[in-house]
């Protein structure tokens, strides 16, 4: 699987999850998030050669098409597969609120 | 929605579904598919600016991150959202077989 266990331990050029730390205040301008200060959102990148973690029949077909027609602009793209939530603390006035934001952390990628 | 109804009628630079005809024999080397000869598989392409048809919170965050950090390599990617099946005819020896291949035709895209 193109997950953090594999991708963070290997120098993988093709589609894989990459570490990306986002600071809420500095990188997003989100001053309202008090905790955490930032988090590893991660991201997916890298070429999607034929059959590499193909998400659907279409991505398999497109991967093969791209292999046999290298000049074509159509090719699958490396995108998140498994995502995990992130729990944040913020304030509404003086009242603290804890919320779980879904799909915030990329754990693995796929070619779609 | 970034679907064929919208994308095929507009000159859209950003993420949208694009027409792509694939000939099974010529483009994929699939001699075993006898009908149809080919089909519109379509594909997704184009930049994913902040908030454009964002698939998850992560793609929204990444889109914003990319807007505020234009030099960053991390950005959402335009990929298929809705796909439709394709019915094909092939032969196993002298016996005709009809099969519905799932997720073969891209009908709309999203930023993921």
């Amino acid at each position: 699987a193109l997950d953090t266990n594999y991708c963070f331990r290997n120098l993988e050029e093709n589609c894989c999850v990459r570490p990306l730390y986002i600071d809420f205040r500095q990188d997003l301008g989100w001053k309202w998030v008090h905790e955490p200060k930032g988090y590893y959102a991660n991201f997916c990148s890298g070429p999607c050669p034929y059959l590499r973690s193909a998400d659907t029949t279409h991505s398999t077909v497109l991967g093969l098409y791209n292999t046999l027609n290298p000049e074509a602009s159509a090719s699958p793209c490396c995108v998140p597969q498994d995502l995990e939530p992130l729990t944040i603390l913020y304030y509404v006035g003086r009242t603290p609120k804890v919320e779980q934001l879904s799909n915030m952390v990329v754990k693995s990628c796929k070619c779609s | 929605a970034l679907d064929t109804n919208y994308c095929f009628r507009n000159l859209e630079e950003n993420c949208c579904v694009r027409p792509l005809y694939i000939d099974f024999r010529q483009d994929l080397g699939w001699k075993w598919v006898h009908e149809p000869k080919g089909y519109y598989a379509n594909f997704c392409s184009g930049p994913c600016p902040y908030l454009r048809s964002a698939d998850t919170t992560h793609s929204t965050v990444l889109g914003l991150y990319n807007t505020l950090n234009p030099e960053a390599s991390a950005s959402p990617c335009c990929v298929p959202q809705d796909l439709e099946p394709l019915t094909i005819l092939y032969y196993v020896g002298r016996t005709p077989k009809v099969e519905q291949l799932s997720n073969m035709v891209v009908k709309s895209c999203k930023c993921s």
């Epitope: - | 001699k31 006898h34 009908e35 019915t87 005819l89 092939y90 032969y91 020896g93 002298r94 005709p96």
Partner: antibody, heavy 119, light 111 residues
Framework: EVQLLESGGGLVQPGGSLRLSCAAS????????MSWVRQAPGKGLELVAD??????????YYSDSVKDRFTISRDDSKSTVYLQMNSLRAEDTAVYYC??????????WGQGTLVTVSS | DIQMTQSPSSLSASVGDRVTITCRAS??????????MHWYQHKPGKQPKLLIY???NLASGIPSRFSGSGSGTDFTLTISSLQPEDFATYYC?????????FGGGTKVEIK
């Protein structure tokens, strides 16, 4: 260009044998089933024997009229299909065509070879 | 086995005539939206030639005056304007199941 060249036809006595050959070129012979179709004088076309590719285990078919007397075989290394005809009868007199059917239809045909069974 | 019945067995027509030949199968030769019926032209001393495949698709190099239609058990070959070179015998053939079988043929003669 697809070419199918039959040979081996001729005059033979009833009860005798003949071996027809069909040399193929211009297509991926290994991938496709090959057939022998005949036309007897004043009659229509009849599929006599058929052999599919290695992918499908060289499965064969014979019409009831030739079963246990005719044998179809192929040599993929030579791109050639054969029809071994034994115990020939007068009613086997016909033009025998070699043909290839990539997908249900007989797309290409040889020029035919005449087999005459007569005493 | 699926039996194929062609009609008429012979017909006389003139150059320029519209000619229709029918083929009826003893059971359906269609599967899903695919119609597994094919048509051939056969002239004396020549090899048969594929005209129409899968009911309505014109084979390579065949003039557009030839057309095919039908589904299920009933199929038609039409020659919109008969030409001198079209006088021949025409056969239908199915590939719905093994064995594939031919119709008895329709001989198109000059009136």
């Amino acid at each position: 260009e697809v070419q199918l060249l039959e040979s081996g036809g001729g005059l033979v006595q009833p009860g005798g044998s003949l071996r027809l050959s069909c040399a193929a070129s211009g297509f991926d012979f290994n991938s496709y089933g090959m057939s022998w179709v005949r036309q007897a004088p004043g009659k229509g076309l009849e599929l006599v024997a058929d052999i599919v590719s290695k992918t499908y285990n060289y499965t064969t078919y014979y019409s009831d009229s030739v079963k246990d007397r005719f044998t179809i075989s192929r040599d993929d290394s030579k791109s050639t299909v054969y029809l071994q005809m034994n115990s020939l009868r007068a009613e086997d007199t016909a033009v025998y065509y070699c043909t290839v059917a990539p997908g249900g239809s007989f797309d290409y045909w040889g020029q035919g070879t005449l087999v005459t069974v007569s005493s | 086995d699926i039996q194929m019945t062609q009609s008429p067995s012979s017909l006389s027509a003139s150059v320029g005539d519209r000619v229709t030949i029918t083929c009826r199968a003893s059971q359906s030769v269609s599967i899903s939206r695919f119609n597994l019926m094919h048509w051939y032209q056969h002239k004396p001393g020549k090899q048969p030639k594929l005209l129409i495949y899968r009911a309505s698709n014109l084979a390579s190099g065949i003039p557009s005056r030839f057309s095919g239609s039908g589904s299920g058990t009933d199929f038609t070959l039409t020659i919109s304007s008969l030409q001198p070179e079209d006088f021949a015998t025409y056969y239908c053939q199915h590939s719905r199941e093994s064995p594939w079988t031919f119709g008895g043929g329709t001989k198109v003669e000059i009136k």
